[in-house]
């Protein structure tokens, strides 16, 4: 069977008026994914945005990244898509410095 | 122009289905997700799920995942709403809506879907 | 799920009339608020997204503030257009939820 990733946004300070936004699936199965970032509800092209390998995380599973540089003020225009075995989840920046894990369920 | 334009109501019986259709045009129908929400007479809104037009991935609420099937047809820039055994609590407006971003921007008219015996 | 408090949920006011109508979410939602007006037999209207920004075409009057758990929508002066039902949704996490909506009517 399939298991749904864990999803979960962070922001970080970037250079002065930029903050780099990245998005972690962990914890799914297969390996098959679509991780990215969509700004007003499309996808960015690829050349801007920065993605890490689908590794293995040691428990049979897998986990990616995928990282934008964005100015800031404009988070809330941006979404980490995810899409995995047939079903998708969107998932927001969060405000100020915190984080949040969004789980999605098949 | 945006728009979502949808199928005619509809009039069904316990445990049949219905088929709710979501016509796009004015946009790239691929690029945006399709939310749909379904309101009951007098009642607030209630969140159904969403599809990708250009991938068919869905995500669902828990509420309605084994009843509820979303598609959509890129030939015809049309996305679908099918729900299952009906009951009369499905009695109740259907729209489709566009994400753009982190809203809806755009709705469509609503379908009214009556459930009766 | 988050749940969203609307309030009040009607409320009779006079054309010039200043209106709140507030939405308290059961967990932070990061300003991932919109506000639409729905009138009998149509559709949601989006007037504010993101708490605040206005949408296009919406008449200044309509104003959005709000962060964490609560929000607002005020009508700084009501119209005879703005007799509506409205009703705030929270985009933070699925499933999207929707305040119970808010009935303003004419006193």
């Known amino acids: 069977g399939s298991v749904p990733p864990m999803v979960n946004v962070t922001r970080s300070e970037a250079s002065e008026g930029n903050i780099t936004v990245t998005c972690r699936a962990s914890s799914f199965y297969p390996r098959n994914i679509t991780l990215t970032w969509r700004q007003d509800g499309v996808s960015l092209s690829h050349d801007t945005q920065q993605w890490g390998d689908v590794l293995p995380d040691g428990n049979g599973t897998y986990q990616t990244w995928v990282a934008t540089r964005i100015c800031q003020g404009e988070e809330q225009r941006f979404t980490c898509y995810m899409e995995h075995s047939g079903n998708h989840s969107t998932h927001p920046v969060p405000s100020g410095n915190s984080h949040h894990h969004h789980h999605h369920h098949h | 122009e945006v728009q979502l334009v949808q199928s005619g109501a509809e009039v069904k019986k316990p445990g049949a289905s219905v088929k709710v259709s979501c016509k796009a045009s004015?946009?790239?129908?691929?690029?945006?997700?399709i939310e749909w929400v379904r309101q009951a007479p007098g009642q607030g809104l209630e969140w159904i799920g969403a599809i990708n037009p250009g991938s068919g991935a869905t995500n669902y609420n828990e509420k309605f995942k084994d009843r509820a099937t979303l598609t959509a047809d890129k030939s015809t820039n049309t996305a679908y709403l099918e729900l299952s055994s009906l009951r009369s609590e499905d009695t109740a407006v259907y729209f489709c809506?566009?994400?753009?971003?982190?809203?809806?921007?755009?709705w469509g008219q609503g379908t009214l879907v009556t459930v009766s015996s | 799920d988050i749940q969203m408090t609307q309030s009040p949920s009607s409320l009779s006011a006079s054309v010039g009339d200043r209106v709140t109508i507030t939405c308290r979410a059961s967990?932070?939602?990061?300003?991932?608020l919109a506000w639409y007006q729905q009138k009998p037999g149509k559709s949601p209207k989006l007037l504010v997204y993101y708490a605040e920004t206005l949408a296009d075409g919406v008449p200044s009057r309509f104003s959005g503030s709000g962060s964490g758990t609560d929000y607002t929508l005020t009508i700084s002066s009501l119209q005879p257009e703005d007799f509506a039902t409205y009703f705030c949704?929270?985009?933070?996490?699925?499933?999207?939820?929707f305040g119970q909506g808010t009935k303003v009517e004419i006193k």
């Open positions: 809506a566009r994400f753009l971003g982190n809203y809806f921007d755009n």
């Open positions: 004015g946009y790239a129908f691929t690029n945006y997700l």
């Open positions: 949704q929270q985009f933070w996490t699925t499933p999207y939820t």
């Open positions: 967990g932070n939602i990061h300003s991932y």
